[in-house]
C-alpha cells in the first residue's frame, strides 16, 4: 500500500480521531462508572419485605383479639340483661312470697324451660336409640341373610378350567355351523315349497357362506385355540405366569387373517328375553 | 402512586431501557474479505472513521447517556418511595406498640368486668334461691316430669343389653364374612392378549347367533303354517 | 499518535469492531443495572400497596379498640348499676334467714334434675354407640367384584348357548312342520295324478 | 405542551462565530438530556452536541475544538457557541430535547457560512 509521512494532514486527522473517540469512550465509561444506580441493599429490600409481612400478620392476630373480644363484650351484656331482669324476678318472688292466693297457682306452673328442653331432649334420644338398635339388628339380618345367599351361589359355581373355555368356544363354533346349515336347509325346503322367499340377507360375507369361507373360518379357530392352549402351556412351565407367551409369527398371520375376514361387531348380549337361565356354568 | 408510571408488566422497567437503548441504524459495514488488505486513500479512510464514529456517537453513546438517565431518575424516586415506605414502617411499628398495649389493656378490663359479672349472678342466683327455696311446693308438671324420669333407668338397661348384643353380632357376622372373602377364589389368568381373541370370537359368535334367531323370526313372520 | 502507514480496510474494521464490542459491553451494563432497578420497582409497588392497606388496617383496628374500650366502660358502669340494686335485696333475705328453712320440695327437685342428668349422658353415649356402629355398617358394604373379566366371558358363553339352545329347539319346530307340510304336498300331488291318470283312462 | 425555539442563526463569513440560543418550556427541563442536530440540504440530520443534566458534554468530530455547547438550567436555556466557522457548517440547525423514549425538536435556525 501507499506510504505517508507523518506530518501527512489527513493521517494525523485519522490519528487524532481514533484517539479522540478512544477518549470519549472512556469519558462514557467514567460517566457510567460515577452514576449511582444503588437503591439499596438486598438486606434493605428483604427487610421491607418481611417487616410488612410481620406487621400485616400481627394485624391479623390483633384483629382476630378484638374480634374475639367483641363477641366477649356482647355475652357480657347478655348476662348483664339477664342480672336485670333476675333482679326483677327477685323483686317480684319476694313479693309473691308474701301473697297467699299465690301458693295454689304454683301447683299449676309450668316446667322451667330449661328442665323442659332437657326432658324433650331425653325423649327424642330414646326414641331414637329405641328405633336404631331394631334398625341396625334388622340391617344385619339381610346382610347376613345376603351373605349367606351369596356363599349358596358361589357353590353353585364352577369356574371353568381354560381348556373348558376354549373347547366350549369352539363347540359353539360347531354348533353355529351345524345350526347355520340347518337352517339353510329349512330355508331352501321352505323356498321350494313356495311359501317363503328370502328376504334377510346374512350381514356376514355373503348370503349363504360359501363352504370355503367356513372352512377358513374354522380353521383360524382351530389355530387360535391352539394357539391360546399353547400360550398357556407355556406359561405354567416359565416361573413368572403373568407374562404371556408370544406366538409363533405363522399363528400371527394366521390369526391377523382371521381378524381382517370380519366386521368388528358391537358387543352385546345377544340371547332374546324370552330364553331360559344361563345353561353353561350352572350345575344341572 | 409516582412507581405506577412503568410497572404494569414485571419487567417493563427493563424493557423500557432496552427500548431506549435499542439502535435504528447498523454499525459500519466494510468491504468484500478480499479487499480487506487494501489500504483505501487516507482521504476515504479519515471518511470512513467519521461517518463510524459519528454512528458510535448517536447510536450507542447518546443512548447509553439517555439510559444513565433514566435509570438515575428512576433510582431517585425508588430511593425517595423506599426512604418514605421506611419511615412509613417505622411509624407502623410505633402503632403496633400502642395497639399491642391496648390490647393488653382490653384484656384486663375484660377480664375484670367478667369476674365481677361472675360475681354478681352468683349473688343473683344464692338471692334468687334463698326466695324460691321458701315455697314448699313441687307443681304438677315437676311431679309428672319426675315419674317419667323414674321409668327410663330400667328401659335403658335392656337397652343397653340389646346394643352389646347386636354389637356381638356384627363383629360375629363380620369375622364370618371376612373368612368367606379372605378364602382364595379359583380362578383362571388370562392375558391381555388371550382375553381380547376371546372377546374377538365372542363377538363373532353373537353375531352368528343373532343373524340366526334374526332368520328364525323372519321365518316365522312370514310363513303361516 | 497518527499512525506512520495508511490503515488497511482490515485494520480499520477491527478497530470499529473493538469499540463496538467496547459499547455492546458498556450496554450490557446498563441492563443489568436495569434489571436490579426493576427488581427494587417491583418490591417497591408491591410493598407500598401492602403499607397502605396495613394503614387502613391500624386504623381500622384503633377504631374498633375505641369502640371495644367504650363498651368496657359502659358495662362496668353498669355493673356498678346491678350491684346497688342487689346489695338492698341480700339485705332483706339476711334479715328473713331467722325464719326460713331449706324445705323437701327444693331437695327432690335437685334430685329431679340429677336424674334428668344423669339419664341424658346415658342417652347420648348409647346414641354415640349406635351411630358407631351404623358408621360402620354403612362403610363395610361394599359391593362385590363384578368386574372379573372371566365372570363376564361366562355370562356372555351362558347366553350363546341359550341362544343355539333356541335356535336349536325352534329349527327342530320348524323342521318338523316342513316335513308335515312336505307330506300334505306329496300326498296332494299323488292324488292330483291318480285323478289325472283315471282321467285319461 | 413543550416548546423549544432556536435563536442566533445568520450569514457568517468563514472563520467567523455564532451563538445559537435555545430556549424551553412545557416541560421539566433538568430532567432532559439536550442536543444540537443540523441539516445541510440534501443530507440527513446529524448530531453536532449535546450535554446531559448532570453537564457532561460530547461533540460530533466536526464540531469538536470549535464548538461548545452548555446549559443554563435555571433560564431553561441550552446555547451552542460555534467558532471558526467553515463553509461545510452551513445548515439549519435544530435544538432537541431527549428523555428516556421522549425526543423533541425546534423548528430550526438557519446558519448560512459565505464568503
Known amino acids: 500500500g501507499h506510504q505517508w509521512k507523518d506530518s501527512d494532514p489527513v493521517m494525523a486527522g485519522i490519528g487524532e480521531e481514533i484517539a479522540h473517540f478512544q477518549k470519549e469512550l472512556e469519558e462514557l465509561k467514567a460517566r457510567t462508572s460515577k452514576a449511582c444506580f444503588q437503591v439499596g441493599t438486598s438486606e434493605e429490600m428483604k427487610m421491607l419485605r418481611t417487616e410488612s409481612d410481620d406487621l400485616h400478620t400481627f394485624l391479623l392476630e390483633i384483629k382476630e383479639t378484638t374480634e374475639s373480644l367483641h363477641g366477649d363484650i356482647s355475652s357480657l351484656k347478655t348476662t348483664l340483661l339477664e342480672g336485670f331482669a333476675g333482679v326483677e324476678e327477685a323483686r317480684e318472688q319476694n313479693e309473691r312470697n308474701r301473697d297467699s292466693g299465690y301458693l295454689h297457682l304454683l301447683y299449676k306452673r309450668p316446667l322451667d324451660p330449661k328442665s323442659e328442653a332437657q326432658l324433650q331432649e331425653i325423649r327424642r334420644l330414646h326414641q331414637y336409640v329405641k328405633f336404631a338398635v331394631q334398625d341396625v339388628n334388622d340391617v344385619l339380618d339381610l346382610e347376613w341373610d345376603q351373605h349367606l345367599e351369596q356363599k349358596k351361589k358361589q357353590r353353585h359355581l364352577l369356574v371353568p378350567e381354560r381348556e373348558t373355555l376354549f373347547n366350549t368356544l369352539a363347540n359353539n363354533r360347531e354348533i353355529i355351523n351345524q345350526q347355520r346349515k340347518r337352517l339353510n336347509h329349512l330355508v331352501d325346503s321352505l323356498q321350494q315349497l313356495r311359501l317363503y322367499k328370502q328376504t334377510s340377507l346374512w350381514s356376514l360375507s355373503s348370503a349363504v357362506p360359501s363352504q370355503s369361507s367356513i372352512h377358513s373360518f374354522d380353521s383360524d379357530l382351530e389355530s387360535l385355540c391352539n394357539a391360546l392352549l399353547k400360550t398357556t402351556i407355556e406359561s405354567h412351565t416359565k416361573s413368572l405366569p403373568k407374562v404371556p407367551a408370544k406366538l409363533s409369527p405363522m399363528k400371527q398371520a394366521q390369526l391377523r387373517n382371521f381378524l381382517a375376514k370380519r366386521k368388528t361387531p358391537p358387543v352385546r348380549s345377544t340371547a332374546p328375553a324370552s330364553l331360559s337361565r344361563s345353561a353353561f356354568l350352572s350345575q344341572r | 402512586s409516582p412507581l405506577r408510571v412503568l410497572a404494569e408488566t414485571p419487567d417493563s422497567f427493563e424493557k423500557h431501557i432496552r427500548s431506549i437503548l435499542q439502535r435504528s441504524v447498523a454499525n459500519p459495514a466494510f468491504l468484500k474479505a478480499s479487499e480487506k488488505d487494501i489500504a483505501p486513500p487516507p482521504e476515504e479512510c479519515l471518511q470512513l472513521l467519521s461517518r463510524a464514529t459519528q454512528v458510535f456517537r448517536e447510536q450507542y453513546i447518546l443512548k447509553q447517556d439517555l439510559a444513565k438517565e433514566e435509570i438515575q431518575r428512576r433510582v431517585k424516586l425508588l430511593c425517595d418511595q423506599k426512604k418514605k415506605q421506611l419511615e412509613d414502617l417505622s411509624y407502623c411499628r410505633e402503632e403496633r406498640k400502642s395497639l399491642r398495649e391496648m390490647a393488653e389493656r382490653l384484656a384486663d378490663k375484660y377480664e375484670e368486668a367478667k369476674e365481677k359479672q361472675e360475681d354478681i349472678m352468683n349473688r343473683m342466683k344464692k338471692l334468687l334461691h334463698s326466695f324460691h327455696s321458701e315455697l314448699p311446693v313441687l307443681s304438677d308438671s315437676e311431679r309428672d316430669m319426675k315419674k317419667e324420669l323414674q321409668l327410663i333407668p330400667d328401659q335403658l338397661r335392656h337397652l343397653g343389653n340389646a346394643i352389646k348384643q347386636v354389637t356381638m353380632k356384627k363383629d360375629y357376622q363380620q369375622q364370618k364374612m371376612e373368612k368367606v372373602l379372605s378364602l382364595p377364589k379359583p380362578t383362571i389368568i388370562l392375558s391381555a392378549y388371550q382375553r381380547k381373541c376371546i372377546q374377538s370370537i365372542l363377538k363373532e359368535e353373537g353375531e352368528h347367533i343373532r343373524e340366526m334367531v334374526k332368520q328364525i323370526n323372519d321365518i316365522r313372520n312370514h310363513v303361516n303354517f | 499518535a497518527a499512525a506512520s502507514s495508511a490503515m488497511t480496510y482490515a485494520q480499520l474494521e477491527s478497530l470499529i469492531n473493538k469499540w463496538s464490542l467496547e459499547l455492546e459491553d458498556q450496554e450490557r451494563h446498563f441492563l443489568q443495572q436495569a434489571t436490579q432497578v426493576n427488581a427494587w420497582d417491583r418490591t417497591l409497588i408491591e410493598n407500598g400497596e401492602k403499607i397502605t392497606s396495613l394503614h387502613r388496617e391500624v386504623e381500622k383496628v384503633k377504631l374498633d379498640q375505641k369502640r371495644l374500650d367504650q363498651e368496657l366502660d359502659f358495662i362496668l358502669s353498669q355493673q356498678k348499676e346491678l350491684e346497688d340494686l342487689l346489695s338492698p335485696l341480700e339485705e332483706l333475705v339476711k334479715e328473713q334467714s331467722g325464719t326460713i328453712y331449706l324445705q323437701h320440695a327444693d331437695e327432690e327437685r335437685e334430685k329431679t334434675y340429677k336424674l334428668a342428668e344423669n339419664i341424658d349422658a346415658q342417652l347420648k353415649r348409647m346414641a354415640q354407640d349406635l351411630k358407631d356402629i351404623i358408621e360402620h355398617l354403612n362403610t363395610s358394604g361394599a359391593p362385590a367384584d363384578t368386574s372379573d373379566p372371566l365372570q363376564q366371558i361366562c355370562k356372555i358363553l351362558n347366553a350363546h348357548m341359550d341362544s343355539l339352545q333356541w335356535i336349536d329347539q325352534n329349527s327342530a319346530l320348524l323342521q318338523r312342520k316342513v316335513e308335515e307340510v312336505t307330506k300334505v304336498c306329496e300326498g296332494r300331488r299323488k292324488e292330483q295324478e291318480r285323478s289325472f291318470r283315471i282321467t285319461f283312462d | 405542551q413543550v416548546q423549544l425555539v432556536e435563536s442566533g442563526g445568520g450569514l457568517v463569513q468563514p472563520g467567523g462565530s455564532l451563538r445559537l440560543s435555545c430556549a424551553a418550556s412545557?416541560?421539566?427541563?433538568?430532567?432532559?438530556?439536550m442536543a444540537w442536530y443540523r441539516q445541510a440540504p440534501g443530507n440527513q440530520r446529524q448530531l453536532v452536541a449535546y450535554?446531559?443534566?448532570?453537564?457532561?458534554?460530547v461533540y460530533a468530530s466536526s464540531a469538536r475544538g470549535r464548538f461548545t455547547i452548555s446549559r443554563d438550567n435555571a433560564k431553561n436555556t441550552v446555547t451552542l457557541q460555534m467558532n471558526s466557522l467553515l463553509l461545510d457548517d452551513t445548515a439549519v440547525y435544530y435544538c432537541?430535547?431527549?428523555?428516556?423514549?421522549?425526543?423533541?425538536y425546534g423548528q430550526g435556525t438557519q446558519v448560512t457560512v459565505s464568503s
Open positions: 450535554i446531559t443534566s448532570d453537564g457532561s458534554t
Open positions: 412545557g416541560f421539566t427541563f433538568t430532567d432532559y438530556l
Open positions: 432537541s430535547a431527549k428523555s428516556g423514549l421522549k425526543d423533541y
